[in-house]
Interface confidence: medium
């Protein structure tokens, strides 16, 4: 399987909410001994490899934000985590895997990485990640929304 990032750039005004998304592509083994570890973290564009450094998102580590479940199963982190830190990670039946960040501030700007690890109890392992940039802009009216785009494309859409 692979991980796709539908959008590589999200531009949002302060105070808005944004949902960053990764998508699991390709065949996913649904065997009883196969599970998936999915998580999010902040990183930097390393010279050698993007996403190799793992930093917390709003003081929550990748361990705090992880989901662990089988195949294309729905899962999400609990609401008390979302309420306390304005974060919620979720995974649906279609391979979409997201983190929602509420009430954005300028400090939320940066590179975000999703990580998916296929666990087969050590008979094999497969690990993939995706990266996307979040730019939070000051002074925009509260009515404006986030824009999501691929940096290389001129097209952009309004993000949910």
């Amino acid at each position: 399987f692979k991980v796709a990032t539908p959008y590589s750039l999200y531009v949002c005004p302060e105070g808005q909410n944004v949902t960053l998304t990764c998508r699991l592509l390709g065949p996913v083994d649904k065997g009883h001994d196969v599970t998936f570890y999915k998580t999010w973290y902040r990183s930097s564009r390393g010279e050698v490899q993007t996403c190799s450094e793992r930093r917390p998102i709003r003081n929550l580590t990748f361990q705090d934000l992880h989901l662990h479940h089988g195949g294309h199963q729905a899962a999400n982190t609990s609401h008390d985590l979302a309420q306390r830190h304005g974060l919620e990670s979720a995974s649906d039946h279609h391979g979409n895997f997201s983190i929602t960040m509420r009430n954005l501030t300028l400090l939320d700007s940066g590179l975000y990485c999703c990580l998916v690890v296929e666990i087969r109890h050590h008979h094999s392992e497969h690990r993939v990640h995706g990266a996307m940039e979040l730019q939070v802009q000051a002074g925009k009216g509260s009515g404006s929304t986030c824009m999501a785009s691929n940096e290389q494309d001129s097209d952009s859409i309004t993000a949910a």
Epitope: S52, H68, A75, S78, L81, V117
Partner: antibody, heavy 120, light 112 residues
Framework: EVQLQQSGPELEKPGASVKISCKAS????????MNWVKQNNGKSLEWIGN????????TYNQKFKGKATLTVDKSSSTAYMQLKSLTSEDSAVYYC?????????????WGAGTTVTVSS | DVVMTQTPLSLPVSLGDQASISCRSS???????????LHWYLQKPGQSPKLLIY???NRFSGVPDRFSGSGSGTDFTLKISRVEAEDLGVYFC?????????FGGGTKLEIK
Amino acid sequence: EVQLQQSGPELEKPGASVKISCKASGYSFTGSNMNWVKQNNGKSLEWIGNIDPYYGYTTYNQKFKGKATLTVDKSSSTAYMQLKSLTSEDSAVYYCARDYDYALGYFDVWGAGTTVTVSS
Amino acid sequence: DVVMTQTPLSLPVSLGDQASISCRSSQSLVHSNGNTYLHWYLQKPGQSPKLLIYKVSNRFSGVPDRFSGSGSGTDFTLKISRVEAEDLGVYFCSQSTHVPYTFGGGTKLEIK
């Protein structure tokens, strides 16, 4: 057979540093976090931290930050822990232990332990 | 850090008896994703710890079914239905819901 082979006992003087090794065999070394655990006098266990051998990413118990440094050599499937500025408090048995499920924190394979003795 | 408190410290039993070890955490071990990362290990004299039970009640492969784990939130129990000689040693509970991972102080299972 999955094994973690640890280096032999160490006798060090106070203030010195020591580097102990843990060689993995029988499985994909980069597939799971490698953890290090300290045991004093055969009593309680303390988690020092872990390292993701794939990325080299480390997570430390705050208590051991500045004391322990975790590294890996992927080419030889070996994890290392360096302990610096040794004192008698560091005399203990140190275990490496593999995470059973990547990074979920339960350890199915343990090394035999390396005894570190700090004495002048 | 999460403090794990095990009781009793020492548990004298007769072979064939049932044994029960309690582990209490200073805060809930329910992870935000709904899982509870509470585990049990057995360390025999002169050996490394061995994983018995993971995530409260899942027996690790090769562990006899006389071992069972239960509990939720902050209170957990390991039961051995019929103690055999090979079960003697020190039992540790451990949590990996919160970093740093922490262990209980151990319960020594010994012959009466």
